[in-house]
């Protein structure tokens, strides 16, 4: 078993990207607040091409995307489901 699988013990994202990931290729987004041994917010995106990447939580495009997805989820099924994982 790889160390990377013990995700409750430390940060999962050793590096992040700030480049834009298009909404059309996003399958799932997970926002994890600080906690469980990781002092920072982590944003993980799963793409439709079977990749999983860490994204800079402060990237402006991500903030816009999260607002867009959350506003859509109020009226319909979101294109990219957002899960907020509690770090308790």
């Amino acid at each position: 078993i790889l160390e990377a699988h013990y995700t409750n013990l430390k940060c999962r994202c050793s590096g992040v990207i700030s480049t834009v990931v298009g909404l059309n290729i996003i399958d799932r987004i997970q926002v994890t607040p600080p906690g469980n041994g990781c002092p920072k917010t982590e944003v993980v995106i799963w793409t439709k091409m079977k990749k999983v990447i860490c994204v800079n939580p402060r990237a402006k495009w991500l903030q816009r995307l999260l607002r867009h997805v959350q506003s859509k989820s109020l009226s319909s099924t979101p294109q990219a489901p957002v899960s907020k994982r509690r770090a308790a």
């Epitope: 790889l2 990377a4 699988h5 995700t7 994202c13 079977k50 999983v52």
Partner: antibody
């Protein structure tokens, strides 16, 4: 505990179809993010990626073999399959199946089967 | 397709030696590179993931690094149990591609 095991014919003749089965436990191909890949290794040589199949039935193939490869799965039986048509001597190799899980950090092929030696000979 | 050029193809070193194996990527792969160790008669197993992260249970004498398109696996002080084949794998994009492998032998 994750385990994988390959099965299939040990020997077959040129132009025949090779059918391999990967039986696994410790994970399910119905779970989001789970995948199984096939990799082969001719004796004394390097590894060659062949194909991947994912929980949602998304499939990826090595372009150099795409016309001869078919990957599939039986989720309820915890099995993945690979078919290679029209085999020839260069297909002689040890064939491995390996698990991938879309977690972060993403480490494809984190668990491997023991491999099965396949010989193509007339 | 992304080509991974691995060198050397074989390497003979003495116990305690520092050895380095290199893979060069033909296109940008970022940090999406794994090093696998394959002991004789066994299946491959990841030792380094994301270019420089040590997999669980792997001794700290193993390390990974990157300089541009060159990716290196270093063993700081060779031990007998390190005798194995080593393979790099890029998974930046499909098709995934492996290096040709390096056979590490103990003198």
């Amino acid at each position: 505990q994750v385990t994988l095991k390959e099965s299939g014919p040990g020997i077959l003749q040129p132009s025949q179809t090779l059918s391999l089965t990967c039986s696994f436990s410790g994970f399910s191909l119905s779970t989001y993010g789970m995948g199984v890949g096939w990799i082969r290794q001719p004796s004394g040589k390097g590894l060659e990626w062949l194909a991947n199949i994912w929980w949602d039935d998304d499939k990826y193939y090595n372009p150099s073999l795409i016309n001869r490869l078919t990957i599939s799965k039986n989720t309820s039986n915890n099995q993945a399959f690979l078919k290679i048509t029209n085999v020839d001597a260069p297909d002689t190799a040890t064939y491995y199946c390996a698990r991938s899980e879309l977690v972060m950090p993403y480490v494809p092929f984190d668990f491997w089967g023991q491999g099965i030696m396949v010989t193509v000979s007339s | 397709d992304i080509q991974m050029t691995q060198s050397p193809s074989s390497l003979s070193a003495s116990l305690g030696d520092r050895i380095t194996i290199t893979c060069q990527a033909s296109q940008d792969i970022g940090i999406d590179l794994i090093w696998f160790q394959q002991k004789p008669g066994k299946s491959p197993w990841p030792v380094i993931y994301y270019t420089a992260n040590l997999a669980s249970g792997v001794p700290s004498r193993f390390s990974g690094s990157r300089s541009g398109s060159h990716y290196s696996l270093t063993i700081s002080s060779l031990e007998s149990e390190d005798m194995a084949d080593y393979h790099c794998l890029q998974y930046k994009q499909y098709p995934f591609t492996f290096g040709s492998g390096t056979k590490l032998e103990i003198k």
